[in-house]
Interface confidence: low
Protein backbone atom coordinates (compact mmCIF):
# COMPACT_ATOMS: atom_id res chain seq x y z
CA UNK A 1 0.00 0.00 0.00
CA UNK A 2 1.37 3.38 -0.98
CA UNK A 3 0.06 6.02 1.44
CA UNK A 4 -0.03 9.80 1.11
CA UNK A 5 2.40 11.31 -1.33
CA UNK A 6 1.78 14.81 0.04
CA UNK A 7 4.79 15.98 2.05
CA UNK A 8 3.64 18.06 5.05
CA UNK A 9 7.15 19.42 5.51
CA UNK A 10 7.26 21.21 2.17
CA UNK A 11 8.25 20.25 -1.38
CA UNK A 12 11.22 17.92 -1.68
CA UNK A 13 11.70 17.42 2.06
CA UNK A 14 10.22 13.97 2.37
CA UNK A 15 11.43 10.55 1.25
CA UNK A 16 12.26 10.62 -2.46
CA UNK A 17 14.82 9.57 -5.05
CA UNK A 18 18.06 11.58 -5.15
CA UNK A 19 21.05 11.18 -7.43
CA UNK A 20 24.53 11.28 -5.91
CA UNK A 21 27.55 11.29 -8.22
CA UNK A 22 30.31 8.93 -7.10
CA UNK A 23 33.67 7.88 -8.51
CA UNK A 24 35.00 4.33 -8.35
CA UNK A 25 37.39 5.57 -5.67
CA UNK A 26 34.46 6.95 -3.62
CA UNK A 27 32.82 3.54 -3.77
CA UNK A 28 36.01 1.57 -3.06
CA UNK A 29 35.63 -0.17 -6.42
CA UNK A 30 38.77 1.07 -8.21
CA UNK A 31 40.52 -2.28 -7.77
CA UNK A 32 37.88 -4.44 -9.41
CA UNK A 33 35.70 -2.28 -11.68
CA UNK A 34 36.89 -0.89 -15.03
CA UNK A 35 33.78 0.91 -16.17
CA UNK A 36 31.90 3.15 -15.64
CA UNK A 37 34.50 5.46 -14.06
CA UNK A 38 31.71 7.40 -12.39
CA UNK A 39 28.32 6.22 -11.17
CA UNK A 40 25.16 8.29 -10.83
CA UNK A 41 23.91 6.52 -7.71
CA UNK A 42 20.17 6.85 -7.18
CA UNK A 43 19.28 6.63 -3.51
CA UNK A 44 16.32 7.20 -1.23
CA UNK A 45 16.77 10.21 1.02
CA UNK A 46 14.39 12.31 3.09
CA UNK A 47 12.07 12.34 6.06
CA UNK A 48 9.20 9.94 6.70
CA UNK A 49 6.54 11.93 8.55
CA UNK A 50 3.27 10.33 9.60
CA UNK A 51 1.99 7.88 6.96
CA UNK A 52 4.01 9.44 4.12
CA UNK A 53 4.64 6.69 1.57
CA UNK A 54 4.07 4.00 4.20
CA UNK A 55 5.25 0.76 2.62
CA UNK A 56 2.96 -1.58 4.53
CA UNK A 57 1.11 -2.25 7.80
CA UNK A 58 4.41 -2.49 9.66
CA UNK A 59 5.33 1.05 8.60
CA UNK A 60 1.96 2.34 9.79
CA UNK A 61 2.47 0.65 13.17
CA UNK A 62 5.97 2.11 13.41
CA UNK A 63 4.59 5.61 12.85
CA UNK A 64 1.99 5.17 15.59
CA UNK A 65 4.49 3.77 18.10
CA UNK A 66 7.14 6.38 17.24
CA UNK A 67 4.60 9.08 18.10
CA UNK A 68 3.91 7.40 21.46
CA UNK A 69 7.46 6.26 22.30
CA UNK A 70 9.93 8.36 20.29
CA UNK A 71 12.88 7.34 22.46
CA UNK A 72 12.21 3.63 21.93
CA UNK A 73 10.79 3.36 18.44
CA UNK A 74 12.48 5.21 15.57
CA UNK A 75 10.49 6.92 12.84
CA UNK A 76 10.06 4.99 9.60
CA UNK A 77 13.03 5.19 7.27
CA UNK A 78 13.29 6.11 3.60
CA UNK A 79 14.49 3.07 1.65
CA UNK A 80 14.26 1.66 -1.87
CA UNK A 81 10.98 0.02 -2.84
CA UNK A 82 12.53 -1.33 -6.05
CA UNK A 83 15.79 -1.23 -7.96
CA UNK A 84 17.10 -0.60 -11.45
CA UNK A 85 19.74 -3.02 -12.78
CA UNK A 86 23.22 -1.77 -13.60
CA UNK A 87 25.98 -3.35 -15.68
CA UNK A 88 29.57 -3.10 -14.44
CA UNK A 89 32.62 -4.02 -16.49
CA UNK A 90 34.78 -5.89 -14.00
CA UNK A 91 38.44 -6.87 -14.03
CA UNK A 92 39.09 -10.60 -13.95
CA UNK A 93 42.24 -12.76 -13.94
CA UNK A 94 41.80 -13.37 -17.65
CA UNK A 95 40.61 -9.92 -18.72
CA UNK A 96 37.19 -8.39 -18.20
CA UNK A 97 33.61 -9.51 -17.68
CA UNK A 98 30.22 -7.85 -17.77
CA UNK A 99 28.20 -8.31 -14.61
CA UNK A 100 24.64 -7.11 -14.03
CA UNK A 101 23.72 -6.02 -10.49
CA UNK A 102 20.02 -5.94 -9.73
CA UNK A 103 20.23 -4.30 -6.31
CA UNK A 104 22.52 -1.37 -6.87
CA UNK A 105 20.45 1.62 -7.98
CA UNK A 106 17.21 2.60 -6.24
CA UNK A 107 14.28 3.02 -8.64
CA UNK A 108 11.49 3.98 -6.26
CA UNK A 109 11.29 4.88 -2.57
CA UNK A 110 9.01 4.25 0.37
CA UNK A 111 9.00 4.55 4.15
CA UNK A 112 9.36 1.53 6.39
CA UNK B 1 24.50 -10.77 0.80
CA UNK B 2 24.44 -10.69 4.58
CA UNK B 3 27.54 -8.90 5.82
CA UNK B 4 29.15 -8.86 9.26
CA UNK B 5 26.96 -9.69 12.23
CA UNK B 6 29.54 -8.39 14.72
CA UNK B 7 28.38 -5.13 16.26
CA UNK B 8 31.33 -2.77 16.81
CA UNK B 9 29.21 -0.53 19.06
CA UNK B 10 28.72 -3.17 21.74
CA UNK B 11 26.21 -5.99 22.36
CA UNK B 12 22.63 -5.20 21.40
CA UNK B 13 23.38 -1.74 19.99
CA UNK B 14 23.20 -2.58 16.32
CA UNK B 15 20.27 -3.38 14.07
CA UNK B 16 18.27 -6.28 15.50
CA UNK B 17 14.77 -7.50 16.31
CA UNK B 18 13.08 -5.85 19.30
CA UNK B 19 9.66 -6.52 20.78
CA UNK B 20 7.47 -3.57 21.70
CA UNK B 21 4.20 -4.23 23.55
CA UNK B 22 1.31 -2.18 22.20
CA UNK B 23 -2.40 -1.97 22.96
CA UNK B 24 -5.07 -1.59 20.29
CA UNK B 25 -5.43 2.01 21.45
CA UNK B 26 -1.67 2.59 20.97
CA UNK B 27 -1.99 1.35 17.41
CA UNK B 28 -5.22 3.22 16.64
CA UNK B 29 -6.97 -0.09 16.00
CA UNK B 30 -9.56 -0.09 18.80
CA UNK B 31 -12.37 0.73 16.36
CA UNK B 32 -11.86 -2.16 14.00
CA UNK B 33 -9.94 -4.95 15.78
CA UNK B 34 -11.46 -7.19 18.46
CA UNK B 35 -8.53 -9.45 19.20
CA UNK B 36 -5.78 -9.61 20.30
CA UNK B 37 -6.25 -6.78 22.81
CA UNK B 38 -2.48 -6.38 22.97
CA UNK B 39 0.14 -6.97 20.27
CA UNK B 40 3.77 -7.93 20.79
CA UNK B 41 5.08 -5.93 17.85
CA UNK B 42 8.43 -7.16 16.58
CA UNK B 43 10.40 -4.35 14.94
CA UNK B 44 13.87 -3.66 13.66
CA UNK B 45 15.74 -1.15 15.78
CA UNK B 46 19.40 -0.23 16.13
CA UNK B 47 22.38 1.33 14.43
CA UNK B 48 23.81 0.30 11.08
CA UNK B 49 27.56 0.85 11.31
CA UNK B 50 29.84 0.14 8.37
CA UNK B 51 28.78 -3.05 6.54
CA UNK B 52 26.82 -4.42 9.52
CA UNK B 53 24.09 -6.67 8.09
CA UNK B 54 24.26 -4.90 4.73
CA UNK B 55 21.22 -6.09 2.80
CA UNK B 56 22.68 -5.72 -0.68
CA UNK B 57 25.06 -3.80 -2.94
CA UNK B 58 23.00 -0.63 -2.50
CA UNK B 59 23.49 -0.76 1.27
CA UNK B 60 27.24 -1.16 0.81
CA UNK B 61 27.32 1.85 -1.51
CA UNK B 62 25.27 3.85 0.99
CA UNK B 63 27.79 3.07 3.72
CA UNK B 64 30.70 4.21 1.56
CA UNK B 65 29.00 7.43 0.49
CA UNK B 66 27.77 8.19 4.01
CA UNK B 67 31.36 8.03 5.20
CA UNK B 68 32.42 10.47 2.46
CA UNK B 69 29.38 12.76 2.47
CA UNK B 70 27.60 12.36 5.81
CA UNK B 71 25.66 15.56 5.24
CA UNK B 72 24.19 14.38 1.95
CA UNK B 73 23.88 10.62 2.30
CA UNK B 74 22.29 9.10 5.42
CA UNK B 75 23.66 5.96 7.02
CA UNK B 76 21.89 2.72 6.16
CA UNK B 77 18.74 2.09 8.13
CA UNK B 78 17.59 -0.93 10.13
CA UNK B 79 14.49 -2.39 8.49
CA UNK B 80 12.71 -5.75 8.23
CA UNK B 81 14.24 -8.32 5.87
CA UNK B 82 11.20 -10.56 6.24
CA UNK B 83 7.90 -10.72 8.12
CA UNK B 84 5.87 -13.13 10.21
CA UNK B 85 2.14 -13.36 9.48
CA UNK B 86 -0.37 -12.32 12.12
CA UNK B 87 -4.09 -13.05 12.40
CA UNK B 88 -6.40 -10.28 13.59
CA UNK B 89 -10.04 -10.78 14.55
CA UNK B 90 -11.74 -7.79 12.97
CA UNK B 91 -15.14 -6.22 13.53
CA UNK B 92 -17.41 -6.28 10.49
CA UNK B 93 -20.97 -5.08 9.80
CA UNK B 94 -22.25 -8.62 10.24
CA UNK B 95 -20.01 -9.72 13.12
CA UNK B 96 -16.36 -10.67 13.00
CA UNK B 97 -13.83 -11.97 10.48
CA UNK B 98 -10.35 -13.44 10.68
CA UNK B 99 -7.80 -11.63 8.56
CA UNK B 100 -4.16 -12.63 8.09
CA UNK B 101 -1.64 -9.81 7.65
CA UNK B 102 1.66 -10.82 6.09
CA UNK B 103 3.51 -7.53 6.57
CA UNK B 104 2.82 -6.65 10.18
CA UNK B 105 5.47 -8.28 12.35
CA UNK B 106 9.16 -8.15 11.47
CA UNK B 107 10.83 -11.57 11.48
CA UNK B 108 14.41 -10.68 10.57
CA UNK B 109 16.34 -7.41 10.17
CA UNK B 110 18.98 -5.97 7.90
CA UNK B 111 20.52 -2.60 7.02
CA UNK B 112 19.66 -0.77 3.83
Amino acid sequence: ARNGDHCPLGPGRCCRLHTVRASLEDLGWADWVLSPREVQVTMCIGACPSQFRAANMHAQIKTSLHRLKPDTVPAPCCVPASYNPMVLIQKTDTGVSLQTYDDLLAKDCHCI
Amino acid sequence: ARNGDHCPLGPGRCCRLHTVRASLEDLGWADWVLSPREVQVTMCIGACPSQFRAANMHAQIKTSLHRLKPDTVPAPCCVPASYNPMVLIQKTDTGVSLQTYDDLLAKDCHCI
Epitope: G12, R13, P70 | V73
Partner: antibody
Framework: QQLKESGGRLVTPGTPLTLTCTVS????????MSWVRQAPGKGLEWIGD??????TTDYASWVKGRFTISKTSTTVDLRIASPTTEDTATYFC????????WGPGTLVTVSL | DIVLTQTPASVEAAVGGTVTIKCQAS??????LAWYQQKPGQPPKLLIY???TLASGVPSRFKGSGSGTEFTLTISDLECADAATYYC???????????FGGGTEVVVQ
Protein backbone atom coordinates in the same frame (compact mmCIF):
# COMPACT_ATOMS: atom_id res chain seq x y z
CA GLN C 1 36.97 25.43 5.14
CA GLN C 2 35.36 28.84 4.92
CA LEU C 3 32.29 30.73 3.74
CA LYS C 4 32.17 34.43 2.88
CA GLU C 5 29.05 36.39 1.96
CA SER C 6 29.23 39.49 -0.21
CA GLY C 7 26.91 41.84 -2.10
CA GLY C 8 25.11 43.41 0.83
CA ARG C 9 24.49 47.14 0.47
CA LEU C 10 21.93 49.92 0.80
CA VAL C 11 19.23 49.64 -1.86
CA THR C 12 15.90 51.30 -2.50
CA PRO C 13 12.72 49.20 -2.40
CA GLY C 14 12.15 47.24 -5.60
CA THR C 15 15.79 47.24 -6.70
CA PRO C 16 16.89 43.61 -7.37
CA LEU C 17 19.89 42.47 -5.36
CA THR C 18 22.10 39.39 -5.55
CA LEU C 19 24.13 38.15 -2.58
CA THR C 20 26.98 35.70 -3.09
CA CYS C 21 28.37 33.06 -0.74
CA THR C 22 31.88 32.03 -1.78
CA VAL C 23 33.11 28.68 -0.46
CA SER C 24 36.69 27.54 -0.01
CA UNK C 25 38.36 24.43 1.35
CA UNK C 26 35.60 21.96 0.50
CA UNK C 27 33.57 20.75 -2.46
CA UNK C 28 30.19 22.40 -2.87
CA UNK C 29 28.86 19.26 -4.58
CA UNK C 30 29.03 17.34 -1.31
CA UNK C 31 26.79 19.63 0.69
CA UNK C 32 23.47 21.36 1.09
CA MET C 33 23.94 25.12 1.48
CA SER C 34 21.46 27.28 3.39
CA TRP C 35 20.64 30.96 3.38
CA VAL C 36 19.46 32.39 6.70
CA ARG C 37 18.71 35.98 7.61
CA GLN C 38 18.45 38.01 10.80
CA ALA C 39 16.66 41.35 11.00
CA PRO C 40 18.17 43.85 13.48
CA GLY C 41 17.44 42.69 17.03
CA LYS C 42 15.43 39.69 15.81
CA GLY C 43 15.89 35.94 15.57
CA LEU C 44 17.24 33.70 12.80
CA GLU C 45 14.99 33.00 9.82
CA TRP C 46 15.64 30.21 7.34
CA ILE C 47 15.14 31.30 3.71
CA GLY C 48 16.01 28.18 1.77
CA ASP C 49 18.74 25.86 0.63
CA UNK C 50 20.30 24.27 -2.39
CA UNK C 51 21.95 20.89 -2.85
CA UNK C 52 25.40 21.53 -4.26
CA UNK C 53 25.39 18.25 -6.17
CA UNK C 54 22.23 18.59 -8.26
CA UNK C 55 21.23 22.20 -7.70
CA THR C 56 17.88 21.14 -6.19
CA THR C 57 16.42 24.01 -4.17
CA ASP C 58 13.95 24.22 -1.30
CA TYR C 59 12.46 27.35 0.22
CA ALA C 60 10.62 28.35 3.37
CA SER C 61 6.86 28.64 2.75
CA TRP C 62 6.87 32.42 3.32
CA VAL C 63 9.37 33.03 0.49
CA LYS C 64 6.74 32.68 -2.29
CA GLY C 65 9.09 33.48 -5.16
CA ARG C 66 10.67 36.55 -3.59
CA PHE C 67 14.06 34.85 -3.29
CA THR C 68 15.94 32.59 -5.71
CA ILE C 69 18.93 30.44 -4.80
CA SER C 70 21.38 29.28 -7.47
CA LYS C 71 24.96 27.99 -7.57
CA THR C 72 28.18 27.79 -9.54
CA SER C 73 31.07 25.44 -8.75
CA THR C 74 32.32 27.61 -5.86
CA THR C 75 29.52 30.06 -5.07
CA VAL C 76 25.91 30.05 -3.93
CA ASP C 77 23.81 33.09 -4.87
CA LEU C 78 20.69 34.51 -3.25
CA ARG C 79 18.69 36.83 -5.48
CA ILE C 80 16.14 39.14 -3.88
CA ALA C 81 13.80 40.01 -6.74
CA SER C 82 12.10 43.07 -5.31
CA PRO C 83 13.35 43.99 -1.83
CA THR C 84 11.08 45.70 0.68
CA THR C 85 12.01 47.43 3.92
CA GLU C 86 11.12 44.17 5.73
CA ASP C 87 14.06 42.50 3.97
CA THR C 88 16.55 44.68 5.88
CA ALA C 89 18.72 42.12 7.66
CA THR C 90 22.09 40.44 7.91
CA TYR C 91 22.16 37.50 5.50
CA PHE C 92 24.20 34.40 6.37
CA CYS C 93 25.06 31.32 4.39
CA UNK C 94 25.62 28.02 6.20
CA UNK C 95 27.14 24.73 5.13
CA UNK C 96 25.22 21.52 5.36
CA UNK C 97 22.05 20.22 6.91
CA UNK C 98 23.38 21.02 10.34
CA UNK C 99 25.01 24.32 9.27
CA UNK C 100 28.33 23.42 10.89
CA UNK C 101 30.14 26.32 9.20
CA TRP C 102 28.78 29.85 8.69
CA GLY C 103 29.96 32.94 6.93
CA PRO C 104 30.28 36.23 8.87
CA GLY C 105 27.18 37.61 7.16
CA THR C 106 26.47 40.54 4.84
CA LEU C 107 24.17 43.43 5.71
CA VAL C 108 21.35 44.43 3.39
CA THR C 109 19.56 47.70 4.10
CA VAL C 110 16.42 48.50 2.14
CA SER C 111 15.41 52.11 2.56
CA LEU C 112 13.89 54.97 0.59
CA ASP D 1 5.25 23.91 8.30
CA ILE D 2 6.87 22.80 11.53
CA VAL D 3 6.90 25.48 14.23
CA LEU D 4 9.50 25.43 17.02
CA THR D 5 8.61 27.16 20.27
CA GLN D 6 11.49 27.99 22.60
CA THR D 7 11.12 28.71 26.32
CA PRO D 8 12.03 30.79 28.18
CA ALA D 9 12.70 33.84 26.01
CA SER D 10 15.33 34.97 28.50
CA VAL D 11 17.04 33.43 31.51
CA GLU D 12 19.57 34.64 34.07
CA ALA D 13 21.97 32.44 36.01
CA ALA D 14 25.15 32.77 38.02
CA VAL D 15 28.61 31.61 36.99
CA GLY D 16 28.91 27.92 37.84
CA GLY D 17 25.15 27.43 37.67
CA THR D 18 22.97 25.49 35.25
CA VAL D 19 20.55 26.69 32.59
CA THR D 20 17.87 24.64 30.86
CA ILE D 21 16.28 25.74 27.59
CA LYS D 22 13.31 23.93 26.09
CA CYS D 23 12.27 23.62 22.46
CA GLN D 24 8.89 22.22 21.44
CA ALA D 25 8.09 21.13 17.89
CA SER D 26 4.56 21.37 16.49
CA UNK D 27 4.86 17.78 15.23
CA UNK D 28 7.24 14.91 15.81
CA UNK D 29 10.65 15.49 14.24
CA UNK D 30 12.26 12.37 15.70
CA UNK D 31 15.77 13.45 16.74
CA UNK D 32 16.29 15.90 13.88
CA LEU D 33 17.11 18.97 15.94
CA ALA D 34 20.18 21.17 16.23
CA TRP D 35 21.16 23.84 18.79
CA TYR D 36 23.16 26.98 18.00
CA GLN D 37 24.84 29.69 20.06
CA GLN D 38 24.98 33.24 18.75
CA LYS D 39 26.80 36.21 20.20
CA PRO D 40 26.16 39.83 19.09
CA GLY D 41 27.74 40.67 15.75
CA GLN D 42 28.68 37.05 15.06
CA PRO D 43 27.17 34.23 13.00
CA PRO D 44 25.57 31.30 14.84
CA LYS D 45 27.79 28.48 16.03
CA LEU D 46 26.65 24.85 15.90
CA LEU D 47 26.63 23.24 19.36
CA ILE D 48 24.56 20.09 19.01
CA TYR D 49 22.98 18.16 16.13
CA UNK D 50 20.68 15.14 15.92
CA UNK D 51 19.27 16.28 19.31
CA UNK D 52 22.16 15.07 21.43
CA THR D 53 25.37 14.80 19.39
CA LEU D 54 28.00 17.33 20.41
CA ALA D 55 29.56 19.26 17.52
CA SER D 56 33.33 19.23 17.16
CA GLY D 57 35.15 21.35 19.73
CA VAL D 58 32.07 22.01 21.88
CA PRO D 59 32.61 21.45 25.62
CA SER D 60 30.71 18.62 27.29
CA ARG D 61 29.06 21.19 29.59
CA PHE D 62 26.55 21.53 26.76
CA LYS D 63 24.06 18.67 26.68
CA GLY D 64 21.17 18.10 24.31
CA SER D 65 18.34 15.66 24.94
CA GLY D 66 14.86 14.81 23.78
CA SER D 67 13.09 13.25 20.83
CA GLY D 68 9.78 13.60 19.05
CA THR D 69 8.37 16.98 20.00
CA GLU D 70 10.17 17.89 23.25
CA PHE D 71 13.84 18.87 23.34
CA THR D 72 16.14 20.37 25.96
CA LEU D 73 19.50 22.11 25.94
CA THR D 74 21.26 22.08 29.32
CA ILE D 75 24.32 24.20 30.00
CA SER D 76 26.07 23.31 33.25
CA ASP D 77 29.02 24.94 35.04
CA LEU D 78 28.11 28.25 33.38
CA GLU D 79 30.93 30.52 32.29
CA CYS D 80 30.80 34.21 31.40
CA ALA D 81 31.57 33.21 27.79
CA ASP D 82 28.25 31.32 27.65
CA ALA D 83 26.30 34.59 27.66
CA ALA D 84 24.60 34.50 24.25
CA THR D 85 21.34 33.78 22.47
CA TYR D 86 20.60 30.11 21.84
CA TYR D 87 18.45 28.80 18.98
CA CYS D 88 16.99 25.40 18.23
CA UNK D 89 16.50 24.40 14.60
CA UNK D 90 14.63 21.60 12.91
CA UNK D 91 16.88 19.60 10.60
CA UNK D 92 14.12 17.15 9.69
CA UNK D 93 15.22 14.19 7.63
CA UNK D 94 18.64 13.65 6.19
CA UNK D 95 18.33 16.10 3.38
CA UNK D 96 17.09 19.53 4.34
CA UNK D 97 17.42 22.28 6.90
CA UNK D 98 14.37 24.13 8.18
CA UNK D 99 12.90 26.54 10.70
CA PHE D 100 14.50 28.04 13.81
CA GLY D 101 13.01 28.55 17.24
CA GLY D 102 12.54 32.09 18.49
CA GLY D 103 15.73 32.10 20.55
CA THR D 104 16.59 32.22 24.26
CA GLU D 105 18.86 34.88 25.68
CA VAL D 106 21.15 33.60 28.44
CA VAL D 107 22.50 36.23 30.83
CA VAL D 108 25.35 35.13 33.08
CA GLN D 109 25.76 37.10 36.30
Amino acid sequence: QQLKESGGRLVTPGTPLTLTCTVSGFSLSDYYMSWVRQAPGKGLEWIGDIYGGSGTTDYASWVKGRFTISKTSTTVDLRIASPTTEDTATYFCGRGITADIWGPGTLVTVSL
Amino acid sequence: DIVLTQTPASVEAAVGGTVTIKCQASQSISSYLAWYQQKPGQPPKLLIYKASTLASGVPSRFKGSGSGTEFTLTISDLECADAATYYCRCIYGDSYGAAFGGGTEVVVQ
